[in-house]
């Protein structure tokens, strides 16, 4: 099943997707669509690139802010709303019959809440779960080690926080790790 990424209403969401151009500089078209990857192309295209640049974007909120020319085609959605929630398809359109790479990622947009977890717990959660999203320009939590995480305050709802703590506790227990 697709990996979940979480963003708060009003923040920027980051949906990772990348490929390695072979040879370097040999870019391929990419499309991002709202909805799971279909058989061909993308449905409900939100952004499309050709071999050189972004050539189709349905809204000014959709951006490729990574190094597009090195294959980082991660999608940033600015100022997300609840309506942005859902599955997105990143399709890397490698030439040839049925050669495309298809990646479904799920964006969960949550309402801002008042609970701020303690810094240590926050770092553990964001490093342990790809479902957690850092906001803005920092990219996905799973690409950063706990020591290098930016000092941003992620606010989460009580339910979400308890769910993550419960899941983290069980995963650590299953792995034999010590729970702090």
């Amino acid at each position: 099943s697709e990996v979940e990424y979480i963003a708060e209403v009003g923040q920027n969401a980051y949906l990772p997707c990348s490929y390695t151009p072979a040879p370097p500089g040999n870019l391929v078209p990419v499309c991002w669509g709202k909805g799971a990857c279909p058989v061909f192309d993308c449905s409900n295209v939100v952004l499309r690139t050709d071999n050189r640049d972004v050539n189709d974007r349905t809204s000014g909120r959709y951006w490729l802010k990574g190094d597009f020319h090195k294959g980082d085609v991660s999608l940033t959605i600015e100022n997300v709303t609840l309506a942005d929630s859902g599955v997105y398809c990143c399709r890397i359109q490698i030439p040839g019959i049925m050669n495309d790479e298809k990646h479904n990622v799920k964006l969960v947009v949550i309402k801002p809440a008042k609970v701020t977890p303690a810094p240590t717990l926050q770092r553990d959660l964001t490093s342990a779960f790809p479902r957690m999203l850092t906001t803005g320009e920092h990219g996905p939590a799973e690409t950063q080690t706990p020591g290098s995480l930016p000092d941003v305050n992620l606010t989460v709802s009580n339910f979400f926080c308890e769910l993550q703590i419960f899941t983290l506790t069980n995963e650590l227990r299953d792995s034999g790790a010590t729970i702090r």
């Epitope: 909805g35 279909p38 058989v39 192309d41 030439p95 040839g96 479904n104």
Partner: antibody, heavy 116, light 107 residues
Framework: EVQLVESGGGLVQPGGSLRLSCAAS????????MTWVRQAPGKGLEWVAN????????YYVDSVKGRFTISRDNAKNSLYLQMNSLRAEDTAVYYC?????????WGQGTLVTVSS | EIVMTQSPATLSVSPGERATLSCRAR??????LAWYQQKPGQAPRLLIY???TRATGIPARFSGSGSGTEFTLTISSLQSEDFAVYYC?????????FGGGTKVEIK
């Protein structure tokens, strides 16, 4: 207004060949995937083949692979289906569609009858 | 090949009544499903795509719902022009496949 007009259908003997054409207008043909769907008399719909915008990728249902060839001429806004080694089970109305996954525009269809 | 099962095969409904058509599959299609209407002697017409999005010009009495393996097309109040055959079509897996159709007839 989008228009898709198929032609080239008719009666052909088993083992024979036909070339269907579809003339497109009212949309940017060169930016669109194009598809053939068929419907045997009194039966349901069956996807047959489709082709990417530049013609670089073509896909076929297994039952027609090696016998049918889809092609396009973007300069003429035209889609084609070359049908060889025709069989009785290829008898159907053939529809030309714009779209890759689902089909928002359809032609009126052209009837292909394979019979001796 | 993915088999799409539509039920019922025939649905007898009176004008003004509600019609509910079902389309089922054995695997997850997310929302990659479309519905078409076909009247005798005519080409099919796209009604719904993405399981629930109405195509351009389609009246609000047509609605689609469901995701995964079970999908529904609902016609809230049948008009005389709605009596036709309805097909679902999945576009999540190759090859693209259609259901066998549901004929909606006048009761």
């Amino acid at each position: 207004e989008v228009q898709l007009v198929e032609s080239g259908g008719g009666l052909v003997q088993p083992g024979g060949s036909l070339r269907l054409s579809c003339a497109a207008s009212g949309f940017t043909f060169s930016n669109s995937w194009m598809t053939w769907v068929r419907q045997a008399p009194g039966k349901g719909l069956e996807w047959v083949a489709n082709i990417k915008q530049a013609g670089t990728e073509k896909y076929y249902v297994d039952s027609v692979k090696g016998r049918f060839t889809i092609s396009r001429d973007n300069a003429k806004n035209s889609l084609y289906l070359q049908m060889n080694s025709l069989r009785a089970e290829d008898t159907a109305v053939y529809y030309c569609n714009s779209g890759s996954n689902y089909f928002d525009y359809w032609g009126q269809g052209t009837l292909v009858t394979v019979s001796s | 090949e993915i088999v799409m099962t539509q039920s019922p095969a025939t649905l007898s409904v009176s004008p003004g009544e509600r019609a509910t058509l079902s389309c089922r599959a054995r695997q997850n299609f997310y929302s990659n499903l479309a519905w078409y209407q076909q009247k005798p002697g005519q080409a099919p017409r796209l009604l719904i795509y993405g399981a629930s999005t109405r195509a351009t010009g389609i009246p609000a009495r047509f609605s689609g719902s469901g995701s995964g393996t079970e999908f529904t097309l609902t016609i809230s109040s049948l008009q005389s022009e709605d009596f036709a055959v309805y097909y679902c079509q999945q576009y999540n897996n190759w090859p693209l496949t259609f259901g066998g159709g549901t004929k909606v007839e006048i009761k």
